[in-house]
Interface confidence: medium
Amino acid sequence: KFSKQSWGLENEALIVRCPRQGKPSYTVDWYYSQTNKSIPTQERNRVFASGQLLKFLPAAVADSGIYTCIVRSPTFNRTGYANVTIYKKQSDCNVPDYLMYSTVSGSEKNSKIYCPTIDLYNWTAPLEWFKNCQALQGSRYRAHKSFLVIDNVMTEDAGDYTCKFIHNENGANYSVTATRSFTVKDEQGFSLFPVIGAPAQNEIKEVEIGKNANLTCSACFGKGTQFLAAVLWQLNGTKITDFGEPRIQQEEGQNQSFSNGLACLDMVLRIADVKEEDLLLQYDCLALNLHGLRRHTVRLSRKNPIDHHS
């Protein structure tokens, strides 16, 4: 559960996150598992640890192996493992399966291809996009933030898409590429009002002060690929990013398609080190699509430790 596969290409930057989470204040130590040798934190090193992140700037084939991260708090340690494989650059255009990130599907109405792992890096727009090694050109292709939008998708648009960007670390630039397959499927779905499955309206969630808490906003929007469907959290009527509390972050969950074909989305709100003042906030789960916008509100209450033991 707490082991994660990561891969990259030699001479490119690779940044790996520890699969175990902790508060920002916790220290994280990294080791090379085979030798139990500590990974340095000084940035002058080619491979160095930076809190929850392990940075290879740039990566080398010899860096392949299992790395251990230990999240240390005053009361406990948590251990995670990062299985890192660095591959030689291919001379031909084919991207082997082992370098591919998860496949995404699109349709005539929905054609977003997200650049995998990009959120780990310090990058600036624009992204460069390639399909089967050819740079994408023409007005049908639009690089927008961390994703590519293809207008009027056709079956011929299926293929392997590579995003390329520059990671900047202390003034030095490193190239990063990531590839995923894009498949085109026929639009045979329908769209309906957002149905928020979780949380329940006006739900009270019990949390423990000092512990971490997760709230999941989950909504379904119809069957098949949706042209517009989004879920997110609001804090006291404010965007999470504008709220300015680094302990509280939202993280996109998995796009879900259940056995009944319903298209659903999750957004997880992670609250690290729950504080008393968090109990005073209003947490709004919002779901939007072409039909309308729905909101469910959650509040936190203190879990009585005695309940926890019973």
């Epitope: 329940a200 609001q234 939007l288």
Partner: antibody, heavy 120, light 113 residues
Framework: QVQLVQSGAEVKKPGSSVKVSCKAS????????VNWVRQAPGQGLEWMGG????????NYAQKFQGRVTITADESTSTAYMELSSLRSEDTAVYYC?????????????WGRGTLVTVSS | DIVMTQSPDSLAVSLGERATINCKSS????????????LAWYQQKPGQPPKLLIY???IRGSGVPDRFSGSGSGTDFTLTISSLQAEDVAVYYC?????????FGQGTKVEIK
């Protein structure tokens, strides 16, 4: 006190486009929703569409789909509504409006309106 | 699209008397999960933009006098002016925000008798 300040009146030829701006004076559009509502002379109110900056996306009334584009530039706190392929029946006062909740449901703050006249 | 139908189209009421405007939606605007009616009322005076009076069917907007009240649920809603004042002469609109496209009623003109 936030005010929505709209661009001035426009006279346009049929087939052309118009772009109306709406600036949030004394505030911003960050985390807000800006909607556009029009009112033809002597007629009622008609919702054209809205941009919910929280989601970074716009929704449009089917009637205007393909002809209207609503955008917002958070750096200048300005929202825009562009209507193309103008016809005489597009002659109206165009209002931008926003709401306190930032979700574009109901509108508690309105611009003073921009009169767009389409005439050959 | 949800069609909003107001009645009457116009209304003449004596100063100090009660004015009642009805609004009917072609489908329910009640979101049962939250028990909220996605309905607002506006007042518009000649040459001015509309002003929000009521939202969530019954909550008064900021600075709106308490003689204005909203009621109703599902498909049938009412705006009541308990004691009409001269400054209340205007056109009143209901609006649903349950479903995109958001739609307005055709308006009700309130005059003094």
């Amino acid at each position: 006190q936030v005010q929505l300040v709209q661009s001035g009146a426009e006279v346009k030829k049929p087939g052309s486009s118009v772009k109306v701006s709406c600036k949030a004076s004394g505030g911003s559009f960050s985390g807000q929703a800006v909607n556009w509502v029009r009112q033809a002379p002597g007629q009622g109110l008609e919702w054209m569409g809205g941009f919910v900056s929280l989601f970074g996306t716009a929704n449009y009334a089917q009637k205007f789909q393909g002809r209207v584009t609503i955008t917002a530039d958070e750096s200048t706190s300005t929202a825009y509504m562009e209507l193309s392929s103008l016809r005489s029946e597009d002659t109206a006062v165009y209002y931008c409006a926003r709401d306190r909740e930032g979700l574009g449901w109901y509108f508690d703050l309105w611009g003073r309106g921009t009169l767009v006249t389409v005439s050959s | 699209d949800i069609v909003m139908t107001q009645s009457p189209d116009s209304l003449a009421v004596s100063l100090g008397e009660r004015a009642t405007i009805n609004c009917k939606s072609s489908q329910s605007v009640l979101y049962s999960s939250s028990n909220e009616n996605y309905l607002a009322w506006y007042q518009q005076k000649p040459g001015q933009p509309p002003k929000l009076l009521i939202y969530w069917a019954s909550i008064r907007g900021s600075g709106v006098p308490d003689r204005f009240s909203g009621s109703g649920s599902g498909t049938d809603f009412t705006l009541t002016i308990s004691s009409l004042q001269a400054e209340d002469v205007a056109v009143y609109y209901c609006q649903q925000y349950y479903s995109i496209p958001y739609t307005f009623g055709q308006g009700t003109k309130v005059e003094i008798k």
